[in-house]
């Protein structure tokens, strides 16, 4: 897994008029890290883990950079010619990565109303766009605007590549990103469902990274997919994740059922409490 820094900015227009403010989210190694609200950008650490390690300087710098990027994205949205009535969004996602072999990647992707229409490899400056004619029209429009803007401001995309990597390296150096594994706490509960049936729920919490297998087994054999309900894997605000799986079983057969958990190469089974 490479280390990664991901910036996600969204700006909106209503009836062709670009709205003030923007939404920005920053993820570090896939974890929510910073957030700016729509009206006033104040970079907020997502979770105590980020706040503890990085000082105010970081939030000030990120606030300044994200505010500038939000302003640029609003200008870009204003130049999209085919805006129709109603609400429209322009989203820019910028990602940079450092791989185990020390090679780097960085790219930016533009979405209009949720549809990808333009990407750029920031390291090489190569542009790519989907084949659809709408996407290509949008892409040429935005690309030409960005190109003119870059010529005026003398800022080129390799600067974005360098800046993103510089930030990522700074965070890695600060120790905020630890290549850690935090095992989940697993808790099994039961509740009455209907006469003769109970619902058993298996919850896993406080784990990192987010990849996990959680499922119910009967006599050691996994239940079919359609007999189980899964919750999404969600951040719990502490840099770790939580999820759950539930199924309905006959009362009196609890001892035949176990919750199976697999995470980062470790696995365990958990019985239903009697």
């Amino acid at each position: 897994e490479p280390h990664s820094l991901r910036y996600n900015l969204t700006v909106l227009s209503w009836d062709g008029s670009v709205q003030s403010g923007f939404l920005a989210e920053v993820h570090l190694d896939g974890q929510p890290f910073l957030r700016c609200d729509r009206q006033k950008c104040r970079a907020k650490p997502q979770g105590q883990w980020a706040e503890d390690v990085l000082g105010n300087k970081t939030w000030d710098r990120e606030t300044r950079d994200l505010t500038g990027n939000g302003k640029d994205l609003r200008m870009t949205l204003a130049h999209i010619k085919d805006q129709k009535e109603g609400l429209h969004s322009l989203q820019e996602i910028r990602v940079c990565e450092i791989h185990e072999d020390n090679s780097t990647r960085s790219s930016q992707h533009f979405y209009y109303d949720g549809e990808l229409f333009l990407s750029q490899n920031l390291e090489t400056e190569e542009w790519t766009m989907p084949q659809s004619s709408r996407a290509q029209t949008l892409a040429m429009n935005v690309r030409n605007f960005l190109k003119e803007d870059a010529m005026k401001t003398k800022t080129h995309y390799h600067a974005m590549h360098a800046d993103c990597l510089q930030e990522l390296r700074r965070y890695l150096k600060s120790g905020v990103v630890l290549r850690r594994t935090v095992p989940p706490m697993v808790n099994v509960t039961r509740s009455e469902a209907s006469e003769g049936n109970i619902t058993v729920t298996c919850r896993a919490s406080g784990f990192y990274p987010w990849n996990i297998t959680l499922s119910w087994r009967q006599d050691g054999v996994s239940l079919s997919h359609d007999t189980q309900q899964w919750g999404d894997v969600l951040p719990d605000g502490n840099g770790t994740y939580q999820t759950w799986v539930a199924t309905r079983i006959c009362q009196g057969e609890e001892q035949r059922f176990t919750c199976y958990m697999e995470h980062s190469g470790n696995h365990s089974t958990h019985p239903v409490p009697s």
């Epitope: 791989h99 090679s103 490899n121 400056e125 190569e126 542009w127 390799h158």
Partner: antibody, heavy 115, light 108 residues
Framework: QVQLQESGPGLVKPSETLSLTCTVS?????????WNWIRQPPGKGLEWMGF???????KYNPSLKSRVTISRDTSENQFSLKLSSVTAADTAVYYC????????WGQGTTVTVSS | EIVLTQSPATLSLSPGERATLSCSAT???????FHWYQQKPGQAPRLLIY???NLASGIPARFSGSGSGTSYTLTISSLEPEDFAVYYC?????????FGQGTKLEIK
């Protein structure tokens, strides 16, 4: 029809600087793409040397970085390669090529480094 | 840098046979930045397949490409006499751009 044509001396003395130019016709080098230099020593594989992009950014292969310079002349729609302090190991066919997936190539020019 | 390793180094087949050439990378490559070239003696290389699976202009449909991550494949479904050449893979994900060492496809 996009065409690329390399030109420059076929013989360079050791320790001197190799200079080649690629003239592009049918497409403006400031419109798009990277404009690359790639070389191939006799009987060997291909080695990417570097590029100048449509925006004027240059990128080089770190194995050659201290010796290689790529520049462009937008008025002539040309880009050039300079490789300093050459040795016999720099004897190769030198190609210029367009793009990132190199869709157009020059026919190549053979450069021999020998005294 | 990302090192590309092609296998086999030499492939000996007869016209009409199917050829499968492999290219393996030391680090993950985005499929949109992966390409294949064909080179015949005394000629410049020619773009064969771009972005992993797209045929370049004028390339016959017997050529196809696939792959993702660190593993890519070039397939020639039924070899024609003019297909015997050297084939190179190339990545444009990250600087420096790199090529594989080549696979020589020769007549058996």
């Amino acid at each position: 029809q996009v065409q690329l044509q390399e030109s420059g001396p076929g013989l360079v003395k050791p320790s001197e600087t190799l200079s080649l130019t690629c003239t592009v016709s049918g497409y403006s080098i400031t419109s798009d793409y990277a404009w690359n230099w790639i070389r191939q020593p006799p009987g060997k594989g291909l080695e990417w040397m570097g590029f100048v992009s449509y925006s004027g950014t240059t990128k080089y292969n770190p194995s050659l970085k201290s010796r290689v310079t790529i520049s462009r002349d937008t008025s002539e729609n040309q880009f050039s390669l300079k490789l300093s302090s050459v040795t016999a190991a720099d004897t190769a066919v030198y190609y210029c090529a367009r793009g990132y997936g190199f869709d157009y190539w020059g026919q190549g020019t053979t450069v021999t480094v020998s005294s | 840098e990302i090192v590309l390793t092609q296998s086999p180094a030499t492939l000996s087949l007869s016209p009409g046979e199917r050829a499968t050439l492999s290219c393996s990378a030391t680090s993950s490559i985005s499929s949109i930045y992966f390409h294949w070239y064909q080179q015949k003696p005394g000629q410049a290389p020619r773009l064969l397949i771009y972005r992993t699976s797209n045929l370049a202009s004028g390339i016959p449909a017997r050529f196809s490409g696939s792959g993702s991550g660190t593993s890519y494949t070039l397939t020639i479904s039924s070899l024609e006499p003019e297909d015997f050449a050297v084939y190179y893979c190339q990545q444009g994900t990250t600087i420096p751009f790199t090529f594989g060492q080549g696979t020589k496809l020769e007549i058996k």
